[in-house]
Interface confidence: low
């Protein structure tokens, strides 16, 4: 190979010629043919011939920095090296690196290579620079975080001479009972049901479910979605890239939940569902999926079991009738836990009690959901609480109310079963979290979930 070793000096690039044994050199600025050994002479003001170094003018493209380097092969002039900014490479920083080659977008995100950068288009239920944050947790229709007052509708069906009323606030996923869903009135020509999230949130999906009404399956077969920030001006969710309303597939029976995701997600305070096709009456149970606008509000694993039993500890434990089989251990303090003994209850009712979760690594905690429980029919719950956090498990800081500059007291539960969510803003960044019950009903009793995300990428 005529170009090996490289006959071109001072960083020149050797190009083999058409004829055997011939070559040409592509010389960096400041040098000239035939072997890039001749210095280009630049006339000065005094019209005296002077020599420009290899870095003048700058041979490096795209903002690269030219640095004089050690001599190559004992050339007359010392050579140079281009230090390229992020996103570029090549001898002269002439190549834009394709950042998408290393697949930075997680969870099905679509990568677009930009100049010295990239962007990820995330599926609706994920967000973040690399689609690393999940944003598809239930927003609280089923659990009760979303209160009755937040769920309204165009009409309510009344049956049995008006004795049965299928109110909008019955439209909670998996609701049980004789009247367990919302049904629109028969004469409602354009029915809708609306959720007021009370603040702008990121909504990434919806789960719908029908119900049996008077023994007959009823459900919404397809629907449209609208959203608003003031409850007055509404926008219909469109088919991406068109002006056509998106018609979402609904249910095919009265009980199987069916989920649809929103890509792109909706960012709004109000969400409205408009039934389009109904089996008999328009009857619905539902849940909205999503997260806070900032993202990072996914369950950290109390309910799912990702947080293991050994990570949950407490100040004391209560035993009903002093029997081991009725021990209300900290490991049972998991949101929605079922069974006779399905929560943590403290051994003492005082303000020095605590429930502690070790998240194993420093974690961003942006919210908390609490729930009470029943001990053999006795309703028990924590009505208010404080939070403390620590990184070593020994030195604790009580979470402060920024405005009042004192310990923040979070509002807790008012019954044994409804979820109560509190947003932690600003978030806690710590390994250990403690719930400090401040007031209670019956005995101090907790089921809970922490919301947040692991360390940001």
């Amino acid at each position: 190979d005529i170009c090996d070793p490289n006959p071109c000096e001072n960083g020149g690039i050797c190009l083999p010629g058409l004829a055997d044994g011939s070559f040409s050199c592509e010389c960096p600025d400041g040098f000239t043919d035939p072997n890039c050994s001749s210095v280009v002479e630049v006339a000065s003001d005094e019209e005296e011939p002077t020599s420009a170094g290899p870095c003048t003018p700058n041979p490096c493209h795209n903002g690269g920095t030219c640095e004089i380097s050690e001599a190559y092969r004992g050339d007359t002039f010392i050579g140079y090296v281009c230090k390229c900014p992020r996103g570029f490479n090549g001898i002269h920083c002439q190549h834009n690196i394709n950042e998408c080659e290393v697949e930075p977008c997680k969870n099905g995100g679509i990568c677009t290579d930009l100049v010295a950068n990239y962007s990820c288009e995330c599926p609706g239920e994920f967000m973040g620079r690399n689609c690393q944050y999940k944003c598809s947790g239930p927003l609280g229709i089923e659990g009760g975080i979303i209160s009755n007052q937040q769920i309204t509708a165009s009409s309510t069906h009344r049956a049995l001479f008006g004795l049965q009323k299928w109110y909008p606030y019955y439209a909670r996923l998996n609701k049980k009972g004789l009247i367990n869903a919302w049904t629109a009135a028969e004469n409602d020509r354009w029915p809708w049901i609306q959720i007021n999230l009370q603040r702008k949130m990121r909504v990434t999906g919806v789960i719908t479910q029908g119900a049996k009404r008077i023994g007959s399956p009823e459900y919404i077969k397809s629907y449209k979605i609208a959203y608003s920030n003031d409850g007055k001006t509404w926008a219909m969710y469109k088919v991406k890239g068109t002006n056509e309303d998106m018609v979402f597939r609904g249910n095919i029976d009265n009980n199987t939940p069916y989920a649809n995701s929103f890509t792109p997600p909706i960012k709004a305070q109000y969400v409205r569902l408009y039934p389009q096709v109904c089996r008999r009456h328009c009857t619905l149970r539902m849940e909205l999926l999503g997260c806070e606008l900032s993202g990072c509000s996914e369950p950290l694993g109390m309910k799912s079991g990702h947080i293991q039993d050994y990570q949950i500890t407490a100040s004391s434990i209560f035993r009903t009738l002093n029997m081991d089989m009725f021990t209300w251990e900290p490991r049972k303090a998991r949101l929605d836990k079922q069974g006779k003994v399905n929560a943590w209850t403290s051994g003492h009712n005082d303000q020095s009690q605590w429930l502690q979760v070790d998240l194993l690594v420093p974690t961003k905690v942006t919210g908390i959901i609490t729930q009470g429980a029943k001990d053999f029919g006795h309703v028990q719950f924590v009505g208010s609480y404080k939070l403390a956090y620590s990184n070593d498990g020994e030195h604790w800081t009580v979470y402060q109310d920024e405005k009042q500059r004192k310990d923040k007291v979070f509002q807790g539960n008012f019954d044994n079963d409804t979820h109560r969510k509190n947003v932690i803003d600003p978030p806690i960044y710590a390994r250990h979290i403690r719930i400090l019950p401040w007031s209670w009903y019956g005995r101090i009793t907790l089921r809970s979930e922490l919301l947040g995300c692991t360390e940001e990428e």
């Epitope: 409602d188 020509r189 354009w190 008077i214 007959s216 399956p217 095919i252 096709v277 109904c278 008999r280």
Partner: antibody
Framework: EVQLLESGGGLVQPGGSLRLSCAAS????????MSWVRQAPGKGLEWVSA????????YYADSVKGRFTISRDNSKNTLYLQMNSLRAEDTAVYYC???????????????????WGQGTLVTVSS | DIQMTQSPSSLSASVGDRVTITCQAS??????LNWYQQKPGKAPKLLIY???NLETGVPSRFSGSGSGTDFTFTISSLQPEDIATYYC?????????FGQGTRLEIK
Amino acid sequence: EVQLLESGGGLVQPGGSLRLSCAASGFTFSSYAMSWVRQAPGKGLEWVSAISDSGGSTYYADSVKGRFTISRDNSKNTLYLQMNSLRAEDTAVYYCAQEGLITFGGVIVIGYFDYWGQGTLVTVSS
Amino acid sequence: DIQMTQSPSSLSASVGDRVTITCQASQDISNYLNWYQQKPGKAPKLLIYDASNLETGVPSRFSGSGSGTDFTFTISSLQPEDIATYYCQQYDNLPITFGQGTRLEIK
């Protein structure tokens, strides 16, 4: 104009199999639930099976459950009924029917057979 | 399953007569009942839906009424082309069930 055209009927021995097809045209096939309804010679109508618009959900009369399978190919606008372990009492004209959509304001209520094919005769006899 | 009982099973009437067919459900089906007409050698045709609503294009001499378990189908003035078998059908619940049919003849 909505058209439903059944085919695949014929004479088959007891215990045998047959596959009926229903070619649909004149409407958006993938948006509608479909059913098979049969009528034994000189007898009344009997609903046999139904399938949801996507094909994800199927329903059967007790008399055919486990022997008949309803399916659809939305890309071909075709409804199918695979009939196995046929019995003499399965002898009938088989109709495919579109589960109709009656609009009431912004809402549509399901439960009608408003378009039917001309039927195909299935005879099960030795 | 919901049983649908139609009566009479057959009837004979003169042109211009008022004809009434009844259908009884074995349980409450609200108004989730349809009526079909089937002429010999033809597929059934939907006439009435939701117990009392006339399907588009169907002559106004046909009507339906009733709710719960008892339903009535009426032809106010019988025409020669009305010779057919008439079926009621419930869709309150699966399986969908039909009445046994009423055969209508001209005297």
